[in-house]
């Protein structure tokens, strides 16, 4: 970086090298060049010469003032015009940064995805800080009082094997950067209450051409949890509003859910589950598309969607799992 150059003087910043975005700052340059009484001192920001707000303080020192500095990073250097020198002489350089102290982390959430072997903790970090911000996740056993700390720059995966202090814990998050430090509220968890069942997946759909055509959605999960509650949501792709059906489910066999849908319309389905009575849901599954036939029965199997229709035949169509804004990984 610019800080590695050989200096013939000094460049510095008030109040500090890294400062709160929007502050008024002063950058000073002091020349110490042999046999040179600088005629002029120049400041450069990201290689571009600054023309305004420069004040000469004395024979060797000048100040550049910025009002409401809003750039996250800038490389500053200053030069001197020395008598009898054709080119400007480099004095020194410095990288400066501006940003914000961290917000208080909130919405601290810890879940154990079944079979993952990890407890995953996430939180809302708040506004962008623009500068390096670290998080320390504190996990304290309510049974042994033992506390463990994990350093991260985003979320954290904690091996469940390392949670040896029983089932009940307090979890909280500290956020810190060069401009400040904040701490979240404490979250109390019980390991048995935060398990999210293995992902539910829609495998295929078929429409049976009865007096009233009905569509059967086949879906399954590898979960070993006995009592599972699920929701399936569906809508015509042209609609904004989802319809939601609720199920109490036992995944010892593939689930079949029946829907009475309008003919010749493309529908989208998603499913999510939670351990019955617990707090956290799976994220919604990938989007599963199925177009109801006009009159002919239709099977949609899990592959890529072709939307091809052969008259009088049952044709396999393939469903892609597109992610849309409606498919956020919500676990609340």
């Amino acid at each position: 970086g610019i800080t590695n150059i050989n200096c013939s003087g000094h460049i510095w910043v008030e109040p500090a090298t890294i400062f709160k975005m929007g502050m008024n700052i002063s950058i000073y340059c002091q020349a110490a060049i042999k046999n040179c009484q600088p005629r002029k001192l120049h400041f450069y920001k990201n290689g571009i010469k600054e023309r305004f707000q420069i004040t000469r303080i004395n024979k060797t020192t000048a100040r550049l003032w910025y009002k409401n500095f809003l750039e996250p990073h800038a490389s500053m250097y200053c030069t001197a015009e020395c008598p009898k020198h054709f080119q400007e002489t480099l004095i020194c350089g410095k990288d400066i940064s501006s940003g914000y102290p961290p917000d208080i982390p909130d919405e601290v959430t810890c879940v154990i995805y079944e079979y993952s072997g990890n407890m995953t903790c996430t939180w809302n970090a708040g506004k962008l800080t623009y500068i390096d911000t670290k998080y320390v996740v504190h996990v304290k056993s309510l049974e042994t009082e033992e506390e463990q700390q994990y350093l991260t720059s985003s979320y954290i995966n904690i091996s469940t094997d390392s949670l040896q202090g029983g089932k009940k814990y307090l979890v909280w998050v500290q956020a810190a950067n060069a401009l400040g430090m904040e701490e979240s509220k404490q979250l109390q968890i019980h390991l048995d209450d935060i398990v999210i069942p293995s992902a539910a997946v829609i495998s295929r759909a078929e429409t049976i051409n009865a007096t009233v055509p009905k569509t059967i959605i086949y879906w399954d999960s590898q979960t070993t949890i006995e009592k599972v509650s699920c929701e399936m949501r569906y809508k015509a792709t042209t609609n904004q509003t989802w319809n939601v059906k609720e199920f109490d489910t036992n995944f010892t066999y593939v689930q079949q859910s029946e829907f009475y849908l309008e003919p010749n319309i493309k529908y989208v389905f998603q499913v999510r589950c939670q351990e019955t009575g617990k707090r956290y849901w799976q994220p919604w599954s990938s989007l599963f598309f199925h177009k109801t036939p006009e009159t002919v029965p239709q099977v949609t199997s899990k592959a890529f969607q072709h939307d091809t229709w052969n008259s009088g035949l049952t044709v396999a169509s393939i469903s892609t799992g597109h992610l849309t804004s409606d498919n956020r990984g919500d676990i609340g």
Epitope: H10, W12, T17, F19, A178
Partner: antibody, heavy 117, light 107 residues
Framework: QVQLVQSGAEVKKPGSSVKVSCKAS????????ISWVRQAPGQGLEWMGW????????NYAQKFQGRVTITADESTSTAYMELSSLRSEDTALYYC??????????WGQGTLVTVSS | DIQMTQSPSSLSASVGDRVTITCRAS??????LNWYQQKPGKAPKLLIY???SLQSGVPSRFSGSGSGTDFTLTISSLQPEDFATYYC?????????FGQGTKVEIK
């Protein structure tokens, strides 16, 4: 030669305020900022805040935010630090210091503030 | 806030000894580190700025080194007037913070 001369010792009651002055001479007062640093008896140094006299810009340590006010009077080359809602733990030697090269190269002689009921 | 940790907190040494004091920042502060000497009843005196630059008028037996998070103040040959408390201070970000101090005493 730059000199920073501070006001005399103060004895204050808990809950009251104190205002310490720091007069600069022998240099361009408005060219550089002034910081305030305190030192409790037998303890280390603690930065309280900074003012850029020419621009009136201030920056305070979070710990003192809301209780400290730093001001400057260019016409008299004097900086002031006012600390309110005093408590016994504010008993300390209060220094003004001038930052140069991002370090404090000139210091006042210190003002002892004693908070006692 | 950036925490500054000095070690040792105190040391005993004799005149002529080489003395080393270390200062560690809780995160990288590039070279924005200063060293001060303070004697009882006196204001601190700047020795080293920008990690390794000697302040004018300070004897050359004082030197500073380091960058990032780890810094060192060295007194190459301790003199009687060097018995004092030494502080490091970061000027990388506000609040500006000091180490807790290292007291150099006569052995």
């Amino acid at each position: 030669q730059v000199q920073l001369v501070q006001s005399g010792a103060e004895v204050k009651k808990p809950g009251s305020s104190v205002k310490v002055s720091c007069k600069a001479s022998g240099g361009t007062f408005s060219s550089y900022g002034i910081s305030w640093v305190r030192q409790a008896p037998g303890q280390g140094l603690e930065w309280m805040g900074w003012i850029s006299a020419i621009f009136g810009t201030t920056n305070y340590a979070q710990k003192f935010q809301g209780r400290v006010t730093i001001t400057a009077d260019e016409s008299t080359s004097t900086a002031y630090m006012e600390l309110s809602s005093l408590r016994s733990e504010d008993t300390a030697l209060y220094y003004c210091a001038r930052p140069l090269k991002q370090a404090f190269d000139y210091w006042g002689q210190g003002t002892l503030v004693t908070v006692s009921s | 806030d950036i925490q500054m940790t000095q070690s040792p907190s105190s040391l005993s040494a004799s005149v002529g000894d080489r003395v080393t004091i270390t200062c560690r920042a809780s995160q990288s502060i590039t070279d924005d580190l200063n060293w001060y000497q303070q004697k009882p009843g006196k204001a601190p005196k700047l020795l080293i700025y920008a990690a390794s630059s000697l302040q004018s008028g300070v004897p050359s037996r004082f030197s500073g080194s380091g960058s990032g998070t780890d810094f060192t103040l060295t007194i190459s040959s301790l003199q009687p007037e060097d018995f004092a408390t030494y502080y490091c201070q970061q000027s990388y970000s506000t609040p500006l913070t000091f180490g807790q101090g290292t007291k150099v005493e006569i052995k």
